[in-house]
């Protein structure tokens, strides 16, 4: 077992006066046994903020069930923050003994009494949309102070201009929220695209927060179909392929119909991915023309991502192929599943 480390993931925490500050601390091991204590400041004059083992700390609550042996989260919440609470807080692990001995300290979390915006959350439309459609994305960030804040939208690094932003409330408040809606026109090449909402605030020291949305979760690129007849593979057998190109997402079901009757249904599995993130897929049907007296209308029907089916047909001439005596079967195969259906 590796030696225990005390992890304080936040180098700094900024909190508005009157609110609660959560100071995160986790340990990487359950060994050694012993209490956790929180201090403000370092050295002999450090101030005890919380002792897991004993004492009364009315403003401090533990975030998780810290009395249990399996607990590794020793984060605390300090209520009713005032400017006097500013400082660096250390989470310190002790080894059980008489007396308990200090084992390891976290790196510290600096608490400043002002408020950063929360990480921007970008959300897109509930339903997918197809290229050439305009969709709306929203970006929200909360809990910041002071009120002055800058929000920008980007698509693949290019700044967008069609958006509206509101900061609430209008009057004085302990903290503020920002809400912005941007309009984005989808293109067929947007599967790999990202929409980014960037928030800059004085508390962020010039390092803006970003929220992202992948257009892969928003876009639907419908497939194009092409049905072609391949050269005859063997006597009386014709290979017909249906090329399904440039579709996204992958969820696709293909049905072959012979003269309007369902011949086979399959789901796209082994697809190839294009550079733009869309997919191609090919299905093929081996038709025994000797099983047909008349011309055959072969139809490739595709249902993509739950949308209404699209289809493409191909007329197969059988007049040049006299039917063999005693045969009334059609053999069908897929490239990955060689089987005859009688």
């Amino acid at each position: 077992e590796e030696e225990l480390q005390v992890i304080q993931p936040d180098k700094s925490v900024s909190v508005a006066a009157g609110e609660s500050a959560i100071l995160h601390c986790t340990v990487t091991s359950l060994i050694p046994v012993g209490p956790i204590q929180w201090f403000r400041g370092a050295g002999p004059a450090r101030e005890l903020i919380y002792n897991q083992k004993e004492g009364h700390f009315p403003r401090v609550t533990t975030v998780s069930e810290s009395t249990k042996r399996e607990n590794m989260d020793f984060s605390i919440s300090i209520s009713n923050i005032t400017p006097a609470d500013a400082g660096t807080y250390y989470c310190v692990k002790f080894r059980k003994g008489s007396p308990d001995t200090e084992f390891k300290s976290g790196a510290g979390t600096e608490l400043s009494v002002r408020a950063k915006p929360s990480a921007p959350v970008v959300s897109g439309p509930a339903a997918r949309a197809t290229p050439q459609h305009t969709v709306s994305f929203t970006c929200e960030s909360h809990g910041f102070s002071p009120r002055d804040i800058t929000l920008k939208w980007f698509k693949n690094g290019n700044e967008l201009s069609d958006f509206q932003t509101n900061v609430d409330p209008v009057g004085e408040s302990v903290s503020y929220s920002i809400h912005s809606t941007a309009k984005v026109v989808l293109t067929r090449e947007d599967v790999h695209s990202q929409v980014i909402c960037e928030v800059a605030h004085v508390t962020l020291q010039g390092d803006p927060l970003r929220g992202t949305a992948n257009l892969s979760e928003t876009i639907r690129v419908p497939p194009t179909l092409e049905v072609t007849q391949q050269p005859v593979r063997a006597e009386n057998q014709v290979n017909v392929t249906c090329q399904v190109r440039k579709f996204y997402p992958q969820r696709l079901q293909l049905t072959w119909l012979e003269n309007g009757n369902v011949s086979r249904t399959e789901t796209a599995s082994t697809v190839t991915e294009n550079k733009d993130g869309t997919y191609n897929w090919m299905s093929w049907l081996l038709v025994n023309v000797s099983a047909h007296r008349d011309d055959v209308k072969l139809t490739c029907q595709v249902e993509h991502d739950g949308q209404p089916a699209v289809s493409k047909s191909h007329d197969l001439k059988v007049s040049a192929h006299p039917k063999e005596q005693g045969s009334n079967t059609a053999a069908e195969n897929t490239g990955s599943n060689e089987r005859n259906i009688y």
Partner: antibody, heavy 118, light 107 residues
């Protein structure tokens, strides 16, 4: 519900062996130190052994070299292999979870009786 | 090994009484002391850990105090179900050791 259930007790002759089991349920077994405690009839409690979450073990002098504690986290099971048994080992054996952050016992099993007699 | 000595060994009290049991360690154990209750034919039940912290589900009529070598368990108002044997235990270092027990009987 957090539960510990001991089994494997019985009558054994002096010098014989016995293996006790403790089946744990209702908690993340691998995250707790586990202990065996025994109690002779009409007597007090005596701590017998511990196995830590990392597999480290400790015993008092009275059983050291004769008893072996082990655990099988995948089966949520604790064991006590008792060899070279003596009449003085006759007792009810309890398994207990070091369930508090400081390894204080919080949950006990119902116990299993071990009788060493010729 | 750390020796734990309980007193008294037995105690008679009436319903509603407040009783105190003491436990002394042969050396400083900080506050790594637990108290257990045991009724005849039953497994021990955990009451208190780190000298004064109540285990989950234990009624607040039980309280513990002390640090170093001297500790006490107090039951504020005895009820019939409280008559049992009580044990203290140090768990600051191995081997963990128990007191010899205090039998609390109805007067």
């Amino acid at each position: 519900e957090v539960q510990l259930v001991e089994s494997g007790g019985g009558l054994v002759q002096p010098g014989g062996s016995l293996r006790l089991s403790c089946a744990a349920s209702g908690f993340t077994f691998s995250s707790y130190d586990m202990h065996w405690v025994r109690q002779a009839t009409g007597k007090g409690l005596e701590w017998v052994s511990v196995i830590g979450i990392a597999g480290d073990t400790y015993y008092p002098g009275s059983v050291k070299g004769r008893f072996t504690i082990s655990r099988e986290n995948a089966k949520n099971s604790l064991y006590l292999q008792m060899n070279s048994l003596r009449v003085g080992d006759t007792a009810v054996y309890y398994c207990a979870r070091g369930g508090s952050w400081d390894d204080a016992f919080d949950i006990w099993g119902q116990g299993t009786m071990v009788t060493v007699s010729s | 090994d750390i020796q734990m000595t309980q007193s008294p060994s037995s105690l008679s009290a009436s319903i509603g009484d407040k009783v105190t049991i003491t436990c002394r360690a042969s050396q400083d154990i900080n506050n790594y002391l637990a108290w257990f209750q045991q009724k005849p034919g039953k497994a021990p039940k955990s009451l208190i850990y780190t000298a004064s912290s109540l285990q989950s589900g234990v009624p607040s009529k039980f309280s513990g105090s002390g640090s170093g070598t001297d500790f006490t368990l107090t039951i504020s108002s005895l009820q019939p179900e409280d008559f049992a044997t009580y044990y203290c235990q140090q768990y600051v270092s191995y081997p963990y050791t128990f007191g010899q027990g205090t039998k609390l009987e109805i007067k």
